[in-house]
Interface confidence: low
């Protein structure tokens, strides 16, 4: 595959009159990455899912959900050509549609699961554009997509690449940050114990200052709950 074909343009815009549906556009045959930001504190401990909706009021049929163990949500889970991964600290759910096809177009939802209920994080309209480098009959893309220029739309450009077979995705920033924080806490705890022993004090009288291990100010490291299936 030539490098040019690995460049994926991702157009994101808010649809007026479509109940805050965010539009993501991808090119047929390439990959499309959909991101759904959310409040990581509000949705702490919850698994996430990606479902396809039949019309605005129709049922939302589950396509793929994050790992059964919430702590392992950063691990990419596949269902066919659709992958899901959750940056639980950063508060970003990412869905990858590999080898995008005309039939992938439609209304979707990013969901946060709790019990048998599901909260909608974002409504997404996936639009599939014909590949300008593919000279097959455009009849394959029989439903119309956006083909005009997007002068009024807020456009984000995203460069993406396909994951090769066996390639291990790099962990999300938040996971690395979490590990770093745990390492720092261990060092500080050891230092505190050492200092307490040195001064003949009981451990814990001078706790280490709070660490900000979140992406935003005010996000403090919380004790992680035990491994559980929420």
């Amino acid at each position: 595959m030539e490098p040019l074909r690995l460049l994926i343009l991702l157009f994101v815009t808010e649809l007026s009159g479509a109940h805050n549906t965010t539009v993501f556009q991808g090119v047929a045959g390439q990959s499309l990455q959909v991101s759904c930001p959310y409040d990581s504190m509000k949705h702490w401990g919850r698994r996430k899912a990606w479902c396809r909706q039949l019309g605005e009021k129709g049922p939302c049929q589950r396509v793929v959900s994050t790992h059964n163990l919430w702590l392992l949500s950063f691990l990419r889970r596949w269902n066919g050509s659709t992958a899901i991964t959750d940056d639980t600290l950063g508060g970003t759910l990412t869905i990858t549609l590999r080898n995008l096809q005309p039939h992938d177009a439609g209304l979707y939802q990013c969901q946060s699961l709790h019990g048998s209920e599901a909260d909608t994080l974002r409504k997404v309209l996936v639009e599939v554009l014909a590949d300008p480098l593919d000279h097959r009959d455009a009849g394959d893309l029989w439903f119309p997509g956006e083909s005009e220029s997007f002068e009024d739309a807020h456009v984000e450009h995203s460069i993406s690449r396909s994951l090769l077979e066996g390639e291990i995705p790099f962990p999300p920033t938040s996971i690395l940050l979490l590990l770093a924080c745990i390492f720092l806490i261990k060092i500080l705890a050891a230092s505190a114990l050492w200092a307490a022993a040195w001064h003949g004090q009981k451990p814990g009288t001078h706790p280490p200052s709070e660490l900000d291990c979140g992406h935003d100010p005010g996000y403090q490291l919380q004790t992680l709950p035990g491994l559980r299936d929420t």
Partner: antibody, heavy 120, light 106 residues
């Protein structure tokens, strides 16, 4: 509840242009989860898809009719239209407008249809 | 073009009978197939989408199955109000419809 209503002349002369309009009520034509279609049915025969239009104005047509078909949208009037040029008696049919679910081939809401006869 | 061959073209059955209609695609269309019901003088009405999913509000006696090239539409217990013509429609490429099956009551 979205409803569609076709309107236009019931009689068109051969070689002229057939023009029909579909008015959408009970919902916005600009809703991004849908596209808008024209389908026709020859007397006593099956259904034939003519083409689709999206709220943005982008279109796709049946290859067999492509050279003669133009579908347009007027979001301010909540309408979309069909023009079929150089008509012959073979274009005599009931013409339906319908709403499709984007990404699905599902036509979930239909107009009641309008009969168009091509005759001199 | 993908051709959709529907059979039979017409059938007559008694109230309560199980009615089966088949639709064959000229090439593999996965599950990209819908079924519609059209009553005389009316517009078609969606019954089944994606080969086997029942549209909201449609009675459960209607069902669909199949994948690839061969599809089946079934009315488990024919009712008088089911008198209509039934069409299959593929959407693997641009939509094409089957020729229709006219269902009558004996």
């Amino acid at each position: 509840q979205v409803q569609l209503q076709e309107s236009g002349p019931g009689l068109v002369k051969p070689s002229q242009t057939l023009s029909l309009t579909c008015t959408v009520s009970g919902g916005s034509i600009s809703s991004g989860g849908y596209y808008w279609s024209w389908i026709r049915q020859h007397p006593g025969k099956g259904l034939e898809w003519i083409g689709n239009i999206y709220y943005s104005g982008s279109t796709v047509y049946n290859p067999s009719l492509k050279s003669r078909v133009t579908i347009s949208v007027d979001t301010s009037k909540n309408q979309f239209s069909l023009k079929l040029s150089s008509v012959t008696a073979a274009d005599t049919a009931v013409y339906y407008c319908a709403r499709g679910l984007y990404g699905y081939g599902v036509l979930d809401v239909w107009g009641q249809g309008t009969m168009v006869t091509v005759s001199s | 073009d993908i051709q959709m061959t529907q059979s039979p073209s017409s059938l007559s059955a008694s109230v309560g009978d199980r009615v089966t209609i088949t639709c064959q695609a000229s090439q593999d269309i996965s599950n990209y197939l819908n079924w519609y019901q059209q009553k005389p003088g009316k517009a078609p009405k969606l019954l089944i989408y994606d080969a086997s999913n029942l549209e909201t509000g449609v009675p459960s006696r209607f069902s669909g199955s199949g994948s690839g090239t061969d599809f089946t539409f079934t009315i488990s217990s024919l009712q008088p109000e089911d008198i209509a013509t039934y069409y299959c429609q593929q959407f693997d490429t641009y939509p094409t419809f089957g020729g229709g099956t006219k269902v009558e009551i004996k």
